[in-house]
């Protein structure tokens, strides 16, 4: 799906200090979905502020969020997942600000896990594998993954590889010999659903072997 090519960045000018953002997670707990919202400004006094979602719900008109420290949270099976919902910040039953949001466009996948790297001596390469809970899901099954790796000493020189599978091969000749590498992976929805990058997986660390030229062998 092409989605919308961006042309400028004209967000609605908020008339108040209650600008907020939300993300959804589908089938995050069995068949239950979740919706998490938080104020953009961490200094907003959230005392007496409530969040409510109305529209595009099954069997009910509106649902109220639970407050957990500075975030607002719903876990439910009642998202219709088609059409726009109206999410409002309220105080004493009065709406302060609202946003119309299609929950299928703000999906944040769960972070990948079980990242590992195995060196294959005969092939002179490294096989990177990881797992994702989304392989078992019924809605957000198709993801694009971003594998990022760097030499540990190069703090900001991350190399990125995008892939749709959970396996990647890195050629030894493209890495520095006898070096420690850090690698991590994150995911984003890639078919119909839209949204945000997941959190990064925990990093995995691996060392590359020294270059070992046998007698008579030429350098690649």
């Amino acid at each position: 799906e092409s989605g919308y090519a961006q042309n400028g960045d004209l967000e609605d000018a908020e008339l108040d200090d209650y600008s907020f953002s939300c993300y959804s997670q589908l089938e995050v707990n069995g068949s239950q979905h979740s919706l998490t919202c938080a104020f953009e400004d961490p200094d907003v006094n959230t005392t007496n502020l409530e969040f409510e979602i109305c529209g595009a719900l099954v069997e009910v008109k509106c649902l109220s969020f639970r407050k957990l420290q500075e975030i607002y949270f719903i876990e439910t099976k009642k998202f219709l997942l088609i059409g726009k919902s109206n999410i409002c910040v309220k105080v004493g039953g009065k709406s302060l600000t609202c946003k119309k949001i299609d929950l299928t466009t703000i999906v944040k996948p769960e972070a990948p896990f079980d990242l590992s790297v195995i060196y294959r001596e005969g092939a002179n390469d490294f096989v990177v594998t990881f797992n994702t809970s989304h392989l078992q899901k019924k809605y957000v099954k198709v993801l694009m993954h971003d594998v990022a790796y760097r030499q540990e000493k190069d703090e900001n020189k991350w190399m990125h590889v995008n892939l749709s599978s959970t396996k990647l091969t890195l050629l030894q000749r493209n890495l520095q010999p006898e070096a420690m590498y850090e690698i991590k992976v994150r995911s984003i929805p890639d078919h119909y659903f839209k949204g945000f990058w997941s959190e990064w997986s925990p990093s995995y660390y691996f060392r590359t072997p020294e270059i070992n030229n046998s007698p008579g062998e030429m350098d690649p």
Partner: antibody, heavy 118, light 111 residues
């Protein structure tokens, strides 16, 4: 009430361009994407493309890329569809439609007839 | 592009009877329980009007005699009982994949 009001009928010569407008009222303009749908005489419906008034972002049916340009003006809650290099095949009724969700159309304009004739 | 095939092309029904229109897609337009199929009614000289979204959800203000069902590649719009004012063309539309395509239409006439 929620309304989309389109500009009036146009008669154009082949090779010319035409710009059709669609003015939204009765709801917050930036809350919903607006799309355009073509209906040639006696024919079915064909999605042309859509625009997100909040960002100005556009999505086009590949078939209409290069033929159609979609724009929006938040100050007047109006979206525009410009058709260029007109040919007889462009003769049709063009509808603007609000997207209530991804991507079905819950409110429609009354339609604008564009006739291309030499 | 996803092709939507409607049948029948035309249909004549007596008032009080049931009218059934089917729409078959060239590939699935469902993601689990999310069915990205919608139905419209168009009367002569008027714009289309949304009847059903998400295969089975009745749009606000649409009479309950209209209903939709189906999943995957096979969907149905049912009008029961048909009334004289239901004379119109009916279109299905998918929204799982750009370009969002419509069926060729079914003309419903009341006998």
């Amino acid at each position: 009430q929620v309304q989309l009001v389109q500009s009036g009928a146009e008669v154009k010569k082949p090779g010319a361009s035409v710009k059709v407008s669609c003015k939204a009222s009765g709801y917050r303009f930036t809350d919903y994407e607006l799309h355009w749908v073509k209906q040639a005489p006696g024919q079915g419906l064909e999605w042309i493309g859509g625009i997100d008034p909040k960002t100005g972002g556009t999505a086009y049916n590949q078939k209409f890329k290069g033929k159609v340009t979609l724009t929006s003006d938040r100050s007047t809650s109006t979206v525009y569809m410009e058709l260029s290099s007109l040919r007889s095949e462009d003769t049709a009724v063009y509808y603007c439609a609000r997207s209530g969700g991804r991507w079905y159309f819950d409110v429609w304009g009354q339609g604008t007839t564009v006739t291309v004739s030499s | 592009d996803i092709v939507l095939t409607q049948s029948p092309a035309s249909l004549a029904v007596s008032p009080g009877q049931r009218a059934t229109i089917t729409c078959r897609t060239s590939e699935s337009v469902s993601i689990h329980l999310l069915h990205l199929m919608h139905w419209y009614q168009q009367k002569p000289g008027q714009p289309p009007k949304l009847l059903i979204y998400g295969a089975s959800n009745l749009e606000s203000g649409v009479p309950a005699r209209f209903s939709g069902s189906g999943s995957g590649t096979d969907f149905t719009l049912t009008i029961n009982p048909v009334e004289a004012e239901d004379t119109a063309n009916y279109y299905c539309q998918q929204s799982i994949k750009d370009p969002y395509t419509f069926g060729g239409g079914t003309k419903v006439e009341i006998k």
